[in-house]
């Protein structure tokens, strides 16, 4: 059967800081999260079946004044979907998206979402991971911050 | 045959107001809009065939000064794609996206688009609907504001 | 076999200017770029096989102060995915997205990405192209600026 995964953020273990970090805690079997014929391990989505896959990610950032003051009002809110090949140890960014934002104190609430998607050839054993900037600003809802993949066709 | 739908906004019936509302008027059979083996009824996209579907939405907001004065320059421009189960009356948000925006009077024109997409298990009889904030700012073009779904695979 | 394409920006030939232009230089056979059972010619992605396709585009814009001063700080950063029919010479926009932006000199770096996607009926011979505003601001990375398509199902 055609492999797929839809992984939602596990908010109990989101890193702090503003630098780019790899998000390693995702749900794969609760709520909207699900996986079939792929593996989730060590924060990475592992391909078990060669093929062409559509990959996607939706990342939401938010800040409310009750959470405290931002260290800077000028933010780079970014997502990077990367592929790592174990056989040839290397990591490459497949897709990136995001925006620079000025989240001023003039408003008590700020929100921003990124969506990326694309069609890629994946080989068994390759790993997909998601990196973001400013992870402490991530929206922890399952409808907000997630990524996934589904196989569309075989490699000829 | 595999079900699909691509529904485009029917701008003749867009609600006013700034609060979150469900958009119930969509075209399903003109221009780019089309549907097959799914049903559009009462503003909802009804699933007729169990399966895993890729769902997506593209929502564009715009304002030109000739349209009048905004009540606030600080806007939350949001979309929520929801699933309603009739058997167990409940509604859940599958995907959300958007941004807070400061649309100042210093510029005569403002525009912003949101795109969300994800892979979900849908059962026959379940309904997909789209909610937005500030519906009076929606771009009424068929290439701007739409949502859709296509079945990727059966449920094992 | 099911047709697909994933085309990445060829940054050696990006137009200048701020007006809307068609992007004609894309890679189809290096890095993440690939094509099968479709044709890339004269800057357009040509459909060789009737069907319903999922189309997508990811467009990133960026500016660093070291690149020089912007002619205006008020920008419309937009993408339009268009379909051209040769038999009936006409061009229509399938999808659009983007945002107006205020990229002030208060920040040395600015970034913004757009993602659009949708499900469309395409006939053999039809051509897909991508237009953007402010092409000189495009991010030339293959993970940043790309578009693609994959066939999901036949036309009944």
């Amino acid at each position: 059967a055609q492999p797929f995964a839809h992984l939602t953020i596990n908010a109990t273990n989101i890193p702090t800081g503003s630098h780019k970090v790899s998000l390693s805690s995702w749900y794969h079997d609760r709520g909207w999260a699900k996986i079939s014929n792929m593996t989730f391990s060590n924060g990475k989505l592992i391909v078990n079946q060669d093929g062409f896959y559509y990959l996607y990610a939706n990342i939401c950032f938010r800040h409310h004044e009750t959470s405290g003051d931002l260290a800077t009002e000028y933010l780079q809110l970014m997502v990077y979907v990367t592929k790592t090949s174990i056989k040839i140890p290397s990591s490459h960014t497949l897709m990136k998206g995001g925006s620079t934002k000025y989240w001023s104190g003039n408003s008590e609430f700020h929100f921003y979402s990124i969506n990326v998607g694309g069609f890629f050839k994946l080989r068994s054993g390759e790993e997909i991971s998601v990196e973001v900037s400013n992870p402490s600003l991530l929206d922890p809802d399952q409808d907000a911050t997630y990524f996934g993949a589904f196989k569309v066709r075989d490699i000829d | 045959a595999q079900p699909f739908a691509h529904l485009t906004i029917n701008a003749t019936n867009i609600p006013t107001g700034s609060h979150k509302v469900s958009l119930s008027s969509w075209y399903h059979d003109r221009g780019w809009a089309k549907i097959s083996n799914m049903t559009f009824s009462n503003g909802k996209l009804i699933v007729n065939q169990d399966g895993f579907y890729y769902l997506y939405a593209n929502i564009c907001f715009r304002h030109h000064e000739t349209s009048g004065d905004l009540a606030t320059e600080y806007l939350q421009l949001m979309v929520y794609v929801t699933k309603t189960s009739i058997k167990i009356p409940s509604s859940h948000t599958l995907m959300k996206g958007g941004s807070t925006k400061y649309w100042s009077g210093n510029s005569e024109f403002h525009f912003y688009s949101i795109n969300v997409g994800g892979f979900f298990k849908l059962r026959s009889g379940e309904e997909i609907s789209v909610e937005v904030s500030n519906p009076s700012l929606l771009d009424p073009d068929q290439d701007a504001t739409y949502f859709g779904a296509f079945k990727v695979r059966d449920i094992d | 076999a099911q047709p697909f394409a994933h085309l990445t920006i060829n940054a050696t030939n990006i137009p200048t200017g701020s007006h809307k232009v068609s992007l004609s230089s894309w890679y189809h056979d290096r890095g993440w770029a690939k094509i099968s059972n479709m044709t890339f010619s004269n800057g357009k992605l040509i459909v060789n096989q009737d069907g319903f396709y999922y189309l997508y585009a990811n467009i990133c814009f960026r500016h660093h102060e070291t690149s020089g001063d912007l002619a205006t700080e008020y920008l419309q950063l937009m993408v339009y995915v268009t379909k051209t029919s040769i038999k009936i010479p006409s061009s229509h926009t399938l999808m659009k997205g983007g945002s107006t932006k205020y990229w002030s000199g208060n920040s040395e770096f600015h970034f913004y990405s757009i993602n659009v996607g949708g499900f469309f009926k395409l006939r053999s011979g039809e051509e897909i192209s991508v237009e953007v505003s402010n092409p000189s601001l495009l991010d030339p990375d293959q993970d940043a600026t790309y578009f693609g398509a994959f066939k999901v199902r036949d036309i009944d």
Partner: nanobody, 127 residues
Framework: EVQLVESGGGLVQAGGSLRLSCAAS????????MGWFRQAPGKEREFVGF????????YYGESVKGRFTISRDNAQNPVYLQMNSLKPEDTAVYYC????????????????????WGQGTQVTVSS
């Protein structure tokens, strides 16, 4: 649960001043357009004033023009109603509401255009 809370009312002599405030809790309304209304016993709710989210535009009811001023802090809550040169006919319960439209319409002075009313604050002006 969304709540608006009005405060600052009281008893004041004619010619005096009061400053009312309207604070929102439960959801982000800090930058919504807001309206002040009042209701005297046995009378309909009457429009007092309106302020946009940025504070850049204000409108007033005819009976309070030149005496009342609506303002808001540069950033967040609350929205204020500064009432000067008070008259006995200003006696009423004062309410604030969140304007429900994206655009300012000609009906901004109608109470039906507002949501999330608070409990009100009593203002009594003695002669």
């Amino acid at each position: 649960e969304v709540q608006l809370v009005e405060s600052g009312g009281g008893l004041v002599q004619a010619g005096g001043s009061l400053r009312l405030s309207c604070a929102a809790s439960g959801r982000t309304f800090s930058r919504s357009a807001m309206g002040w209304f009042r209701q005297a016993p046995g009378k309909e709710r009457e429009f007092v004033g309106f302020i946009t989210g940025s504070g850049g535009t204000t409108y007033y009811g005819e009976s309070v023009k030149g005496r009342f001023t609506i303002s808001r802090d540069n950033a967040q809550n609350p929205v204020y109603l500064q009432m000067n040169s008070l008259k006995p006919e200003d006696t009423a319960v004062y309410y604030c509401g969140v304007y429900r439209r994206t655009y300012i319409s000609s009906t901004y002075s109608e109470s039906s255009e507002y949501d999330y009313w608070g409990q009100g604050t009593q203002v009594t002006v003695s002669s």
